[in-house]
């Protein structure tokens, strides 16, 4: 969490941002809140990016003001216009690109004063893994697949029964470049699997950590997956 305060002259207002991560090719949100004002026409929101000459987005006098917008953000940004009055300056970002990563500034002017806060935005690719029993294999084998990751993640297997065991000798992981030549498909195979056990396939890079669990018994197979972003720090 980054909390910024205004500059001298006028009164300062508190602006708060949260560091976040964007998934390449998907839509993202850059979070920013501020002390609200009673008049929408008195609120100015400016989003800036370090190293970019034009603005990322500007909202003032109750509408988007895009004459100074940098071309790399054209047609890709919007604020939640109906929530500005309650202090939400968060920015929607369409079709997140690798090059969108960097330091952003959320700069606010209201009738109460000015304030700003920086936000670190990471970009990459992350997806939920799915673990299945590989019935084509000669021995009991599990196959963990996740369609989109970047940068290249690490893959670690674990099991409930053999806690702390190192499965690197009995697993094989491969990374296959996807058609857009940035993200990769992750495939990891675990051999010599025993029944009545829960196995976890953990995929992690510096942006996200995802886990796919599978419990195999004689009567059923249960699966569960979850994904966690690693860098959500508020400012």
């Amino acid at each position: 969490l980054i909390i910024g305060f205004g500059i001298s002259g006028r009164h300062s207002i508190t602006v708060t941002t949260v560091a976040s991560a964007g998934n390449i090719g998907e839509d993202g949100i850059l979070s920013c809140t501020f002390e609200p004002d009673i008049k929408l026409s008195d609120i100015v929101i400016q989003w800036l990016k370090e190293g970019v000459l034009g603005l990322v987005h500007e909202f003032k006098e109750g509408k988007d003001e895009l004459s100074e917008q940098d071309e790399m953000f054209r047609g890709r940004t919007a604020v939640f216009a109906d929530q500005v009055i309650v202090g939400n300056a968060s920015l929607r970002l369409k079709n997140v690109q690798l090059t969108d990563a960097g330091t952003y500034k959320c700069y606010i002017i209201t009738s109460k004063g000015k304030g700003n806060a920086n936000l670190e935005y990471k970009t990459g690719a992350f997806s939920m893994p799915e673990v299945n029993v590989d019935y084509n294999a000669s021995s009991e084998t599990l196959r963990c697949e996740a369609p989109r990751w970047f940068p290249q993640p690490t893959v670690v297997w674990a099991s409930q029964v053999d806690q702390g065991a190192n499965f690197s000798e009995v697993s094989n992981t491969s990374f296959e470049l996807n058609s857009e030549n940035v993200t990769m498909k992750v495939v990891s195979v675990l051999y010599n699997v025993t029944i009545n056990n829960t196995y976890s396939c953990m995929i992690e890079n510096d942006i996200a950590k995802a886990t796919g669990d599978i419990k195999v018994t004689e009567s059923e197979i249960k699966r569960r997956s979850h994904l966690q972003l690693l860098n959500s720090k508020a400012s």
Epitope: G25, E26, D27, K63, D64, E65, L66, S67, Q69, R74, G75, R76, T77, A78, A81, R92, K94, N95, S179, E180
Partner: antibody, heavy 121, light 107 residues
Amino acid sequence: QVQLQESGPGLVKPSQTLSLTCTVSGGSISSGGYYWSWIRQHPGKGLEWIGNIYYSGSTYYNPSLKSRVTISVDTSKNQFSLKLSSVTAADTAVYYCARGLSTIDEAFDPWGQGTLVTVSS
Amino acid sequence: DIQMTQSPSTLSASVGDRVTITCRASQSISSWLAWYQQKPGKAPKLLIYKASSLESGVPSRFSGSGSGTEFTLTISSLQPDDFATYYCQQDNSYPYTFGGGTKVEIK
């Protein structure tokens, strides 16, 4: 509700400049929040996006036409215009003006009724 | 540029039929896809935006689905008024591009 109407000559000579205007009624271009686009459709063919403009004057053009296209806006008349230079018979098409749904979602609605421009000597 | 490929190019169907039109993008466009209906001599009419959101005033027999590169427009029960040409359009990235169209004609 917002309505759009294209106007301009239906016949243009080769090598000349095609000029069309889109008049917006039922809403103000200056209210912001929307990009205003030009789209064309060759006879019996599909649709081609030409470019767009924001009320403040910032534009984006389809790279395939960029060297020949100029889109401008006149907020006092609530109009935006298209100029396409050095036209050939390949520019014969129905030209539509349209509004995007928002600054981030550019599905087009509403559209003008379209105007046929024929390039011929 | 992102290429949009529609199939089939022509579709013959009868009133009451369930009709499905497919649109494929040359690269992922997330959910940034719109569908239009066009009748001869008229401007296209927006039916669906953001892949599955029904435009106000459009009958509920029209629905859209898909994300990434594969999308479908479904007409659950074809009505006489639905015989027209349908186009998909991506607004994920500039320049915006349209599919080649699917003409739905009477069988």
